[in-house]
């Protein structure tokens, strides 16, 4: 036999809330639990399962568990079943509801005098109480004609008036919780003795010396009072004006009529209605003057035909908001078509060429009308008027490569040698007609040079070739005096540039042929063994068939390179003392000699009176002191070679004597004069 | 008398490099533009770019600007081809010619050319 | 770049006959076309370059025309030595380009 262990019982429970229906069950053989809600199968969902035997509920809900539920279990093998006794729940709720009128049935029946109930629509289980409140307020019952219980929902207010004016709302309260109303009712019932509003003053905009109307108009019984204040409070009659608004009219109807209005009648109106009882009603409405500004210029702007460009309008500031059009030839654009205005747009699609011209936006607006122009321009691709063309151009001369092109707007013009931009400088410059100035051709300007011109539109190019052709000169010039070392050998080159390589061949100036040791080898002047008849003139002389000849003058000397005679030696020198650095050289022309310490020249004219350079070239140092401590370089030179040669020069201390030692007493130490030395030639 | 003598050509895989050199003599290399053509067998000509004295101005064929590299050695008097990453359409024989004049561009002295084969 | 589009691809002529051989540039190219011959086996040779100048020891039965984009190369009279392949080279921009050669032969 199937016994229940455990049974479902009836139950409080709170709407939303979990609960459970317990349910246990002892049998001999396995058996299937399920239940039943007036008397149909309970189906599982995520709100109501079975967990175990038992039915748990996640959120009661009072529509779908209300009923009885029974627990059935069953042996699928012998079919016996056994059911549980009935359960079910009290289920507690409360749900807020409106404030509705119950009487009469409509606002508009609502009259001064009249009985007026409201309902409150908020219901629960147990059965709640009611509060009502008028404007936040909690009224109480028997208080002010009107009659509430807390255990009615009903609030009645016998008779209505004036003073029950105001926004209705409940609440309620049970065992299960709070809610207040889900949507309140305001009850309006006119006292006619109160100012009531019948016509509102409207803001007005303005032109100036125009006139500006404002309409008040208010009812009561009996009529009420109408009153008009500017700004600070003035009021305006027509018998006392304020000076400046001596040109104010109040009509009987409560009307105020303002003419030839000025800057200073801008400003705040108030229209003042008082009834027999009630509060004043104040309606407040502003005088604008009417301004328009000055419209920003607009920058002139260049299109490419077959593109759609806007341009963007900005009205200027004013009051009344300007209106806003656009203009071409004096023309009103349309709102539609290729040209047309969009807003405050103008819209230019599939531009063609002809649109090309100003066109003007307009503002307007009670102040006045402004404009301003915008320049449009249809772009081009350029064209040729004349390509650069391939150039021979001479060396040393300016050249011109051309790149004349045209187009809307004038086309730039940018040229390129080797693939690289030329940026003008002081040998290249671009002309505004896009021709290229080549200042003064160079060999190395033969090479590719390309022009570009553009627009907005698109570009164009082409390339030329520039050949330079070469001046017949000297690479490098010939120096025009040079030095030969006596019985030695020597060369003295000549080398030219041209068109065609020219033939270079050498002649004595007086036009005596050279000797048999002297050869012109290609150019190059060989002497085996200089003597001293082969100084002279000499010139070089380079031609070719084009371009002729051209003639280098040389003058040859003939020398005896510098040698020293007598170098400086290292010295070293007490303090105080004389020191003596000889320096003396030979050579033809005979050297000059000069000498430098502490890397600066000395100048003999400003030496000073410790300093003295001697006729043969020897350098003395009196009273010597540590700052001249350093290196000495006898420099030898002639018109011809120069050579130089250096020595260290040490300033020591002059060591004080013991009294040990007499007055003939040897130093501690001995001067050292080392004979090592250094020389170039140059 | 102007003689310029290619070298340097022979197999190389594909993606491998050469380098072609051009020996120049007769004339004042050191003044002139020179410049390299090429010619894959039983097909047409093809210019591959040019070169000035001082090598300040380079052209090259678009289609092979970032495969070869044209240089010269003015004290070597020698004209250079450097081919990189070269594949089989780059098989032919390569000329390397003077320049004698840019304007009118006349290259009337051309050498007798190097075989390039680009092959695995 | 300028394409040189070269015309006929082959041509086979007998001895005395004119030959003619044509070239059009997508471009304008001024006169700036060049006409090369080229043996077998050898490199080519220059016979007349820009502005339709016939180059130095040139028989003078090469002649060339043309200005702009179209441009034509004339033999006047053919001879055996003639066979060979012809090209044309247009000057004016980089990068030069050839045309696709005309092959000439004996009829």
């Known amino acids: 036999a199937i016994v229940f262990i455990k049974q479902p019982s009836s139950q409080d429970a709170l709407q939303g809330r979990r609960a459970l229906l317990r349910c246990e069950v002892e049998a001999p053989g396995p058996v299937h639990v399920y239940w039943l809600l007036d008397g149909a199968p309970v189906q599982d969902t995520e709100r109501r399962f079975a967990q175990g035997s038992s039915l748990s509920f996640a959120a009661v809900d009072r529509p779908q568990d209300s009923g009885t539920f029974q627990c059935v279990a069953r042996d699928d093998v012998t079919g016996e079943e056994a059911r549980s006794a009935n359960a079910s729940f009290n289920i507690k709720w409360i749900e807020a509801g409106p404030v509705v009128l119950k009487h009469p049935a409509s606002e508009a029946e609502i009259q001064p005098q009249t009985q007026v109930t409201l309902r409150c629509h908020i219901d629960g289980h147990p059965r709640p109480t009611y509060q009502w409140f008028r404007d936040g307020t909690p009224l109480s019952d028997g208080q002010s004609n009107h009659t509430v219980s807390s255990k009615e929902r009903n609030l009645t207010l016998r008779p209505a008036g004036p003073e029950h004016s105001g926004l209705y709302s409940c609440c309620a309260h049970s065992a299960f919780g709070q809610a207040c109303s889900s949507q309140n009712f305001t009850l309006s019932i006119a006292d006619e003795s109160f100012a009531r509003v019948v016509l509102a003053p409207q803001d007005v905009v303005v032109a100036r010396y125009e006139e500006a109307m404002f309409h008040c108009q208010f009812s009561a019984q009996p009529p009420p009072s109408l009153q008009w204040l500017f700004e600070d409070e003035t009021p305006i009659t027509n018998r006392s004006r304020p000076p400046h608004l001596r040109r104010a009219t109040v009509f009987a109807n409560g009307s105020l009529l303002l003419t030839q209005v000025r800057p200073r009648n801008a400003g705040i109106y108030r229209c003042i209605g008082q009834g027999q009882r009630g509060p004043p009603i104040i309606l407040e409405a502003t005088l604008h003057l009417a301004e328009i500004e000055d419209m920003p210029l607009f920058e002139p702007r260049v299109f490419t035909a077959g593109s759609e460009e806007r341009v963007t309008c900005l009205p200027p500031k004013g009051l009344p908001e300007p209106s806003v059009w656009w203009e071409h030839a004096g023309v009103r654009l349309p709102t539609h078509g290729r040209v047309y205005q969009k807003g405050h747009e103008l819209v230019l699609a599939n531009i063609a060429e002809s649109d090309a011209g100003v066109y003007t936006c307009h503002a307007a607006n009670l102040a006045g009308q402004r404009r301003q122009d915008v320049n449009i321009t249809v772009a081009t691709v350029p064209s040729w008027l004349k390509k650069p063309q391939d150039s021979q151009l001479e060396e040393g001369k300016p050249g011109y490569l051309d790149c004349l092109t045209q187009a809307t707007p004038k086309p730039t013009v940018v040229w390129y040698r080797n693939q690289m931009l030329i940026s003008e400088d002081s040998r290249f410059e671009v002309f505004k007609n896009g021709t290229l100035r080549i200042n003064s051709v160079e060999v190395y300007d033969g090479t590719w040079y390309r022009c570009m011109s553009s627009t907005p539109a698109g570009s164009i190019e082409a390339q030329a070739r520039v050949q330079v052709l070469e001046k017949l000169k000297f690479t490098p010039p010939p120096q025009p005096q040079q030095c030969m070392e006596f019985d030695k050998e020597a060369t003295v080159p000549c080398s030219a540039t041209g068109r065609e390589k020219p033939t270079i061949k050498w002649e004595r100036a007086d036009g005596s042929s050279l000797p048999e040791w002297v050869t012109d080898n290609a150019g190059t002047l060989h002497f085996a063994r200089v003597t001293r008849d082969d100084a002279g003139n000499y010139t070089c002389i380079a031609s070719n068939g084009p371009q002729g000849q051209i003639r280098a003058h040389v003058q040859l000397t003939v020398a005896v390179f510098i040698t020293f005679k007598v170098e400086p030696e290292r010295t070293t020198v007490y303090q105080g003392h004389t020191a003596l650095l000889q320096c003396e050289a030979q050579g033809d022309p005979k050297p000059l000699i000069q000498w430098k310490g502490k890397d600066r020249i000395l100048d003999p004219t400003k030496l000073g009176p410790r300093m003295h350079i001697f006729q043969n070239g020897s350098l003395v140092i009196h009273d010597v002191a540590p700052e001249d401590s350093g290196r000495y370089t006898c420099i030898a030179g002639n018109s011809c070679n120069i050579k130089h040669t250096e020595a260290p020069l040490y300033v020591v201390d002059k060591p004080v004597p013991e009294e040990s030692e007499g007055p003939g007493s040897p130093p501690p130490y001995k001067m050292i004069q080392t004979h090592h030395h250094h020389h170039h030639h140059h | 008398e102007v003689k310029l003598l290619e070298s340097g050509g022979g197999l190389v895989q594909p993606g491998g490099s050469l380098k072609l050199s051009c020996a120049a003599s007769g004339f004042d290399f050191s003044r002139y533009w020179m410049s390299w053509v090429r010619q894959a067998p039983g097909k047409g000509l093809e210019w591959i770019g040019d070169l000035n004295p001082d090598s300040s101005a380079i052209n090259y064929t678009p289609s092979l600007k970032d495969k070869f590299i044209i240089s010269r050695d003015n004290a070597k008097n020698t004209l250079y081809l450097q081919m990189s990453k070269v594949r089989s359409e780059d098989t032919a024989l390569y000329y390397c010619?003077?320049?004698?004049?840019?304007?009118?561009?006349?290259?009337?002295?051309w050498g007798q050319g190097t075989s390039v084969t680009v092959s695995s | 770049e300028t394409t040189v589009t070269q015309s006929p691809a082959s041509l086979s002529m007998a001895i005395g006959e004119k030959v003619t051989i044509r070239c059009i540039t997508n471009t304008d190219i001024d006169d700036d076309m060049n006409w090369y011959q080229q043996k077998p086996g050898e490199p080519p040779k220059l016979l007349i370059s820009?502005?339709?100048g016939l180059r130095p020891g040139v028989p003078s039965r090469f002649s060339s025309s043309g200005y702009g984009t179209d441009f034509v190369f004339t033999i006047e009279n053919m001879l055996s030595e003639d066979v060979a392949d012809y090209y044309c080279l247009q000057s004016d921009n980089l990068p030069l380009t050839f045309g696709s050669g005309t092959k000439l032969e004996i009829k």
């Open positions: 010619t003077l320049i004698t004049t840019l304007v009118p561009y006349t290259m009337d002295f």
């Open positions: 820009e502005g339709n």
